[in-house]
């Protein structure tokens, strides 16, 4: 169940897709990736207030228990609901190769 | 890739499965669930230090960028990797029914 998409904390404050520009050096990939030199990393960032984009029943339970026991149970967390694949040109022993990664860039987000 | 299971913060401090006892009232279910009266809710709680139980490439990227830009990029978060199903006895218009929920109780955890 994809619950409310209205953010009670104000525009852009709740769980959503953000893009962070990162170099191969930033990612620690410079020794094994040749291209692209820079990656527009899409990731899920933001708060998960009550029922906002709750991924499932577990997220709803977590919200309820966090309200009761905030020191024990954390609030739901903003994480990828799905991913976009990406191809990298990698160094190999014999030269270069292409490799697809299907869990690298967040496509959309939810709270869990 | 299920990366290191050694917690550098000390025993039990990193992302792992916890059990929290909750009543139907705690969960806000008292008006639609008859049984069980109490649920042993298994959930994922704990810190996600560098490469600890990294779920995938995205989690590894997040760790790298959090180290570089801690105010912009949050650390990976401890969430369920899979779930255990649970059956509830529910109230219905005509009486009671059994309903299985497959996304209610965390089975194991990872960082993402």
């Amino acid at each position: 169940a994809r619950n409310g998409d209205h953010c009670p904390l104000g525009p852009g404050r709740c769980c959503r897709l953000h893009t962070v520009r990162a170099s191969l050096e930033d990612l620690g990939w410079a020794d094994w990736v040749l291209s692209p030199r820079e990656v527009q990393v899409t990731m899920c960032i933001g708060a998960c207030p009550s029922q906002f984009r709750a991924a499932n029943m577990h997220a709803q339970i977590k919200t309820s228990l966090h309200r009761l026991k905030p020191d024990t149970v954390p609030a739901p967390c903003c994480v990828p609901a799905s991913y976009n694949p990406m191809v990298l040109i990698q160094k190999t022993d014999t030269g270069v190769s292409l490799q697809t990664y299907d869990d690298l860039l967040a496509k959309d987000c939810h709270c869990i | 890739a299920r990366n290191g299971d050694h917690c550098p913060l000390g025993p039990g401090r990193c992302c792992r499965l916890h059990t929290v006892r909750a009543s139907l009232e705690d969960l806000g279910w008292a008006d639609w669930v008859l049984s069980p009266r109490e649920v042993q809710v298994t959930m994922c709680i704990g810190a996600c230090p560098s490469q600890f139980r990294a779920a995938n490439m995205h989690a590894q990227i997040k760790t790298s960028l959090h180290r570089l830009k801690p105010d912009t990029v949050p650390a990976p978060c401890c969430v369920p990797a899979s779930y255990n199903p649970m059956v509830l006895i529910q109230k219905t218009d005509t009486g009671v029914s059994l309903q299985t929920y497959d996304d209610l109780l965390a089975k194991d955890c990872h960082c993402i």
């Epitope: 191809v87 040109i89 697809t100 299907d102 | -």
Partner: antibody, heavy 119, light 109 residues
Amino acid sequence: EVQLVQSGAEVKKPGESLKISCKGSGYSFTSYWIGWVRQMPGKGLEWMGVIDPDGSYTIYSPSFQGQVTISADKSISTAYLQWSSLKASDTAMYYCARYGRYGTYFDYWGQGTLVTVSS
Amino acid sequence: QSVLTQPPSVSGAPGQRVTISCSGSSSNIGVLYVNWYQQLPGTAPKLLIYSNDNRPSGVPDRFSGSKSGTSASLAITGLQAEDEADYYCQSWDSSSNYVFGGGTKLTVL
């Protein structure tokens, strides 16, 4: 506006060499890979290879490895496909295409260059 | 012989819904994405659907993509005369990198 403009049609004899071009405009040429795709008369699409114009890294389909050479000149935003010795079976339409930002699909295509090899 | 298998031809009347299938294996579609291209007669291919079910801007919502297991499909609703074209699926295969289906000729009756 993103555009890939390819060189004109070529008629060649077997054994001759050839270099066709693909000029990119309307975007940062070095930020996107370029691929080459062959379409033989009445047939489907075949991926030939890819080049990263920034570092000039090239990767070829096993079917085309050693048969063609892909290169790029980033100073003039142009990618190339060349043959050192053409065969009649090289007769086809050749397309250059820009890879989308994830490198998984082709988001813009050139108009194609028809290469005819006949004695 | 293509790594991805498509029917050679499909047809439909204007206004109808048609689907084009693309069958692969666990080394391509089964684990990764599928893209679809439209090639109108005498023109270059054009991206229609990327990453299974995403439409680039400018592509009508009559076109939709889906993937299940090792197969994918392209659906076209409200068929129009200008949809008559060749359609190609494309994915990635660990042995040969980018791979295309053999193409499907869509005829609007």
